[in-house]
């Protein structure tokens, strides 16, 4: 049974899905494979802290150390990438903070995406000095393991020289790499000695070998690509939003809820209200009123604007977001001051997401 009573019948489901949301991402911690990573749970007054990764309980093991409010991952691998959460359990409530861990190398092999510096990799030789192929910039080839999130662009580079100018070809897992081997194909920029794959997917995982050759010799270099898969997850709300606010009677105020969701989120703004002088129904559950929800007739559901407020508008405002996987919610308080007092923005505090408990 639901843990609240609705004051009025409100159609909560959108008649038509609103636009796709991907507004705010949780904080991202990046580590290279093999590195150690330490994250502090950014929640206050925690009696007990529990940790999860992609919704599954996280316990200590030979690489994961949990000490107080700190999570340490030793010798990170791409499998450590994912959506993490720490939950602080207190005597009266609990609160959860989400963050992403991304164990990945730089997206391109030692180079920026635009290849502006590529011209110097194309070395021109004196026509008399015949020379087998050689690497001209080994620094750009040092990172062999590339762990990249799905949908990102990957670039592998093998800057080389030789006389006559060598040719370059690419192998995947030791076999000729053909355009039809991946959806969307790939680009080879010979003047930059690079292979570019856009929007990588897990099937792109493998060993990529550049073979650079001329009539005097052949050299090769192998990169390993690991594509870190995403998992669908429930909505994530930006910490600290909505923020507590205060205004004078007759003033205007705005609450903002920043949402990150892979799947269509359904946003509701809810307020605790009284009915017949009571805040709770006969079943002991609080009376709640849906003030606004995403749908065909609702503009910018992440923002709740209140105009010409009265003292009756004071109280707790809840931003509740759901998708097909689950829910998230955070709340803020509105303080309405008498006209003679000047309003001020209160310190931004995230109220407990477990408001329905």
């Amino acid at each position: 049974r639901p843990s609240f009573s609705l004051v009025e019948d409100t159609t909560l489901e959108p008649e038509e899905p609103p636009t796709k949301y991907q507004i705010s991402q949780p904080e991202v911690y990046v580590a290279a494979p093999g590195e150690s990573l330490e994250v502090r749970c950014l929640l206050k007054d925690a009696a007990v802290i529990s940790w999860t990764k992609d919704g599954v309980h996280l316990g200590p093991n030979n690489r994961t150390v949990l000490i107080g409010e700190y999570l340490q991952i030793k010798g990170a691998t791409p499998r450590d990438s994912g959506l993490y959460a720490c939950t602080a359990s207190r005597t009266v409530d609990s609160e959860t903070w989400y963050f992403m861990v991304n164990v990945t190398d730089a997206i391109s092999s030692g180079d920026d995406e635009d290849d502006t510096d590529g011209a110097e990799d194309f070395v021109s030789e004196n026509s008399n000095n015949k020379r087998a192929p050689y690497w001209t910039n080994t620094e750009k080839m040092e990172k062999r393991l590339h762990a990249v999130p799905a949908a990102n662009t990957v670039k592998f580079r093998c800057p080389a020289g030789g006389n006559p100018m060598p040719t370059m070809r690419w192998l995947k897992n030791g076999k000729e790499f053909k355009q039809e081997h991946r959806i969307g194909g790939y680009k080879v920029r010979n003047q930059h000695w690079s292979l570019i794959m856009e929007s990588v997917v897990p099937s792109d995982k493998g060993n990529y070998t550049c073979v650079v050759e001329n009539e005097y010799g052949s050299i090769n270099h192998t990169y390993h690509l690991d594509v870190v898969e995403r998992s669908p997850h429930r909505p994530i709300l930006q910490a600290g939003l909505p923020a507590n606010a205060s205004t004078v009677v007759g003033g205007d105020v705005e609450f903002v809820c920043k949402v990150y969701s892979d799947a269509q989120p359904h946003i509701q703004w809810i307020k605790h209200v009284e009915k017949n002088g009571s805040k709770y129904g006969p079943d002991g559950l609080p009376y709640l009123k849906v003030l606004k929800h995403s749908g065909i007739n609702s503009s910018n559901a992440e923002v709740l604007a209140l105009f010409n407020v009265t003292e009756a508008d004071a109280g707790e405002y809840i931003c509740k977001v759901s998708n097909y996987i689950g829910q998230a919610n955070q709340s803020a308080w509105l303080t309405v001051l008498p006209k003679q007092q000047a309003p001020g923005r209160e310190k931004e505090i995230t109220a407990s997401p477990d408001y329905l408990e």
Epitope: R1, P2, S3, F4, E13, P14, E16, P17, T19, K20, T52, G55, V56, H57, V201, S231, P232, H233, R234, D262, A263, Q264, H266, S322, N323, Y324, I325, G326, Q327, D354, L356, E357
Partner: antibody
């Protein structure tokens, strides 16, 4: 590992009710919806409804509203789907699935016959 | 409710063939579609979510594409173990509706 284990097969009379259980393990039960989906013999899949165990919020397919009741017990990490006023066309396999539909129960065959 | 129209309802193909199934939504659903494989007597198995993301452990021969109302599911090279019924499902708005299914058989 993540598991959803459902209760056993049931044979019911028309007009009666059935309550199917789905015990979850291997993940945080309160962090995901639990969906209920049914499949009549030789037919396709039909979503009945879902519940968010953390606060009991439930959502239903209009076709089942008033007949289906989905509940959850956080203390035992178990979700339930009760279907009342059974008729022969409710004979189906009933599945529970975790919120992301990545994990499903093994299914519970409910046979409605006089 | 959003209707999901899946086609074809059945198809026969040979091992190694490229197989394509389409799903059309009655309303725009962005990329909120999943594809499932179901074998007789078994629960459905998630293959693709959010239109194009292969779920963990799903072979690379399975892929999905599309956005808005038109979606495609592809098996690049059919294997004998792929014989099953495939369903699309929109997870944009409740009720989360499924397509009627495509039964895939080996020639």
């Amino acid at each position: 590992q993540v598991q959803l284990v459902q209760s056993g097969a049931e044979v019911k009379k028309p007009g009666s009710s059935v309550k199917v259980s789905c015990k979850a393990s291997g993940y945080i039960f309160t962090s995901y919806n639990v969906h209920w989906v049914r499949q009549a013999p030789g037919q396709g899949l039909e979503w009945i409804g879902s519940i968010y165990p953390d606060n009991g919020d439930s959502s239903y397919n209009q076709n089942y509203r008033g007949r289906a009741t989905i509940t959850a017990d956080k203390s035992t990490s178990t979700a339930y789907m009760e279907l009342s006023s059974l008729r022969s066309e409710d004979t189906a396999v009933y599945y529970c699935a975790r919120g992301d539909f990545a994990y499903w129960g093994q299914g519970t065959l409910v046979t409605v016959s006089s | 409710d959003i209707q999901m129209t899946q086609s074809p309802s059945s198809l026969s193909a040979s091992v190694g063939d490229r197989v394509t199934i389409t799903c059309k939504a009655s309303n725009g659903i962005s990329n909120d579609i999943a594809w499932y494989q179901q074998k007789p007597g078994k629960a459905p198995k998630l293959l693709i979510y959010s239109a194009s993301y292969r779920y963990s452990g799903v072979p690379s021969r399975f892929s999905g594409s599309g956005s808005g109302t038109d979606f495609t599911f592809t098996i690049s090279s059919l294997q004998p173990e792929d014989i099953a019924t495939y369903y699309c499902q929109q997870h944009s708005t409740t009720p989360y509706t499924f397509g009627q299914g495509t039964k895939l058989e080996i020639k």
